[in-house]
Interface confidence: medium
């Protein structure tokens, strides 16, 4: 090509038009272009409709192009990655109609001051959203409702003073949240929900340590190993966790997680944390929380880091959490991490009703009610949008699982209420090794047999049981890949998808969730 550099790598035809002083799309680009770099040009305005002839285009880099306006006409139905970082956009274009397959959107370092409620409507495939370095002060409560597959969210370096309580609702795949360098003074109660967030960046905010901060303090205590400090130019895998980086602004940089909360209201004599723990729909009996539903949590994603294996957790409904595929060359604005393939532990659990003290870390996860896909904003020219009609009896969830091309994953399905234990495949045979002893009712750390070869020692110092719980050795038979999740009725059977030898399991292996 006379203007741009064209190269073919594997199945991609990459066209590099960076730094060409272009004011418009060059003519006669190869029609089978899959990756188009238009960075560091002087486009000022750009119409996505000009790219409609490029029906294989999956990546578009428009960063550093002095863009003040992006026209979202036409449809690019296969575009997966759009980089609009380092431009002059003052409002986020409504991309849902034009880019229905978008999975990565980078609008970092623009001039966004607010986001309308429907800003992300129609972007149901979005997995990574980067809004770092804008001028956002507030966010609409339902901003992320249309993006249930979101895995990475960066809101760092904005002017946010508060966050909507339900911002992260339904984001079961979220593994990275960057909120550093804002003007946040508190975190609303229940903000983080109950799923583990492996990578959280929260430093550089003026946290106000008073009684309102106690929910956040408790979350920091429970997730200390997942709180990191962002360092520009340092790979996220080389960062070390530092919960002390989250500091009280009104108390000489005292770490929030150590804030004593003296004088704050308490419930009885159990300590001041109870009032600020978030246990949705719990059924309290005096100072106990009764588990009325069995939901088993187990690790589903390993994170390769120098500090060991980290696992994000999903409920027994086997929600899909596929790791995102990342481009080999990361740009500095993209705070991304690479994760190896999912795995499911190889064990069978037989659960019975258990009473917990209220002290242990809550992992309650309200079962989300399925929703149909979000409506799409005003139609682009020449296209008409129709929404699926929800069935009154079995509504289809918006969030669907993310199977890799080689390993189909089970589709997400709510875990049914446990009735009688009923194995999904074959019942577990009698263990050849002696059956593990029930978990005692005193505060100890029981050892749990898994696959008879690997040991898990959960931190269960707060556990008090009314009935014994036994973990049986799992079946040696590998469960085949499933298109549909197994029906879980008190029994969970998993298997290791890769051939790795018994990776170390996270010690916070959790058992039941109170309602």
């Amino acid at each position: 090509h006379p203007i741009c550099e064209v190269s073919k790598v594997a199945s991609h035809l990459e066209v590099n038009c960076d730094k060409r002083n272009l004011t418009a799309l060059p003519p006669d680009l190869p029609k089978d272009t899959t990756i188009l770099h238009l960075s560091e040009n002087l486009l000022y305005t750009f119409s996505l409709a000009t790219l409609m002839p490029y029906t294989r285009l999956t990546q578009l880099n428009l960063d550093r192009c002095e863009l003040t306006k992006l026209q979202v006409d036409g449809t690019l139905p296969v575009l997966g990655t759009l980089d609009l970082s380092h431009n002059q956009l003052q409002s986020l274009p409504l991309l849902g109609q034009t880019l229905p397959a978008l999975t990565v959107l980078d609008v970092s370092f623009n001039r966004l001051t607010s986001l309308p409620l429907g800003a992300l409507r129609g972007l149901g495939e979005l997995q990574e959203l980067y809004l770092k370095g804008n001028e956002l002060k507030t966010l609409p409560p339902g901003l992320l409702t249309p993006t249930p597959k979101l895995e990475k969210l960066s809101l760092a370096n904005n002017n946010l003073t508060e966050l909507p309580a339900g911002l992260l609702n339904g984001l079961e795949n979220l593994d990275t949240l960057l909120l550093q360098e804002n003007s946040l003074y508190t975190i609303p109660k229940g903000f983080f929900g109950s799923h583990l967030l492996p990578f959280a960046f929260l430093h550089g905010n003026p946290w106000l340590c008073n009684c309102e901060i106690l929910y956040f303090r408790r979350w920091l205590q429970d997730n200390a190993e997942n709180v990191y400090v962002w360092k520009q130019g340092v790979d996220v895998k080389a960062m070390t966790s530092n919960v002390a980086s989250v500091q009280c602004d009104n108390s000489d940089k005292f770490p929030v997680y150590k804030y004593p909360g003296k004088g704050c209201p308490t419930l009885g004599d159990e300590g001041d944390t109870d009032l600020y723990d978030y246990y949705p729909e719990e059924d309290t009996e005096g100072d106990k929380v009764r588990a009325t539903r069995t939901v088993v949590k187990f690790p589903t994603k390993a994170h390769t880091t120098p500090w060991g294996l980290f696992y994000s957790w999903s409920t027994a409904s086997l929600d899909s959490q596929m790791p995102s595929s990342l481009h080999p060359t990361q740009e500095s604005t993209k705070e991304q991490t690479t994760f190896p393939p999912r795995w499911t532990p190889n064990f069978t659990l037989h659960m019975e009703s258990i009473t917990f003290s209220k002290t242990p870390k809550s992992t309650t996860e309200p079962t989300p009610s399925p929703t149909t896909s979000e409506p799409v904003p005003e139609p682009a020219p020449n296209m008409t949008t129709l929404e699926p009609t929800p069935s009154p009896t079995t509504p289809e969830p918006t969030s669907e699982p993310a199977p890799s091309p080689t390993t189909p994953e089970p589709t997400s399905e709510p875990a049914p209420s446990p009735t009688t234990p009923e194995p999904t495949s074959e019942p577990a045979p009698s263990p050849t090794t002696p059956e593990p002893t029930p978990i005692p009712t005193i505060a100890t750390s029981p050892t749990i047999l898994v696959s008879a070869t690997s040991l898990i020692t959960p931190k269960s110092t707060f556990l008090t049981t009314t009935k014994p719980v036994s973990l049986l050795e799992s079946t040696k038979k590998t469960i085949p890949e499933l298109d549909q999740p197994p029906k879980l009725r008190g029994v969970l059977q998993g298997h290791l998808e890769s051939s790795r030898n018994d990776p170390f399991l996270h010690p916070d292996f959790c058992c039941l969730l109170p309602l």
């Epitope: 199945s11 991609h12 899959t34 029906t55 294989r56 999956t58 990546q59 139905p77 296969v78 575009l79 997966g80 990655t81 759009l82 229905p100 397959a101 978008l102 999975t103 990565v104 129609g122 149901g124 495939e125 997995q127 596929m322 995102s324 595929s325 990342l326 481009h327 149909t372 896909s373 979000e374 799409v376 949008t385 129709l386 929404e387 699926p388 289809e396 918006t398 669907e400 699982p401 993310a402 199977p403 890799s404 091309p405 080689t406 189909p408 994953e409 589709t411 298109d483």
Partner: nanobody
Framework: EVQLVESGGGLVQAGGSLRLSCAAS???????MGWYRQAPGKQRELVAY???????NYADSVKGRFTISRDNDRNTVSLQMNSLKPEDTAVYYC????????????WGQGTQVTVSS
């Protein structure tokens, strides 16, 4: 690599109907799917697509006549074409959007639809 195989094309009189099907070799429930068409001497044109969540979108020229649907259990996406017109004559290509922004787009080999007047 995912293989997409179209079927159902053929010769039909104006006003008639055809149903195109596209079968994928692997599970595709996560991906948006759709149909393009290309008439001789013309650019490839987007006809319809359906997202993984079930939202559908149609070109103005086919709205009210064409219906796209997907069956995730069978890994198929279909295009029901009613009230066909001669200008619908083209090679129809099924496509599968990328799983992530760094994946390729997968295309079928195309199936010929000819509408005679």
């Amino acid at each position: 690599e995912v293989q997409l195989v179209e079927s159902g094309g053929g010769l039909v009189q104006a006003g008639g109907s055809l149903r195109l099907s596209c079968a994928a070799s692997e599970t595709f429930s996560i991906r948006a799917m759709g149909w393009y068409r290309q008439a001789p001497g013309k650019q490839r044109e987007l006809v319809a697509y359906i997202t993984s969540g079930g939202s559908t979108n149609y070109a103005d020229s086919v709205k009210g006549r064409f219906t796209i649907s997907r069956d995730n259990d069978r890994n198929t996406v279909s295009l029901q074409m009613n009230s066909l017109k001669p200008e619908d004559t083209a090679v129809y290509y099924c496509y599968q959007a990328p799983r992530s922004g760094y994946d390729p787009v997968y295309w079928g080999q195309g199936t010929q639809v000819t509408v005679s007047s």
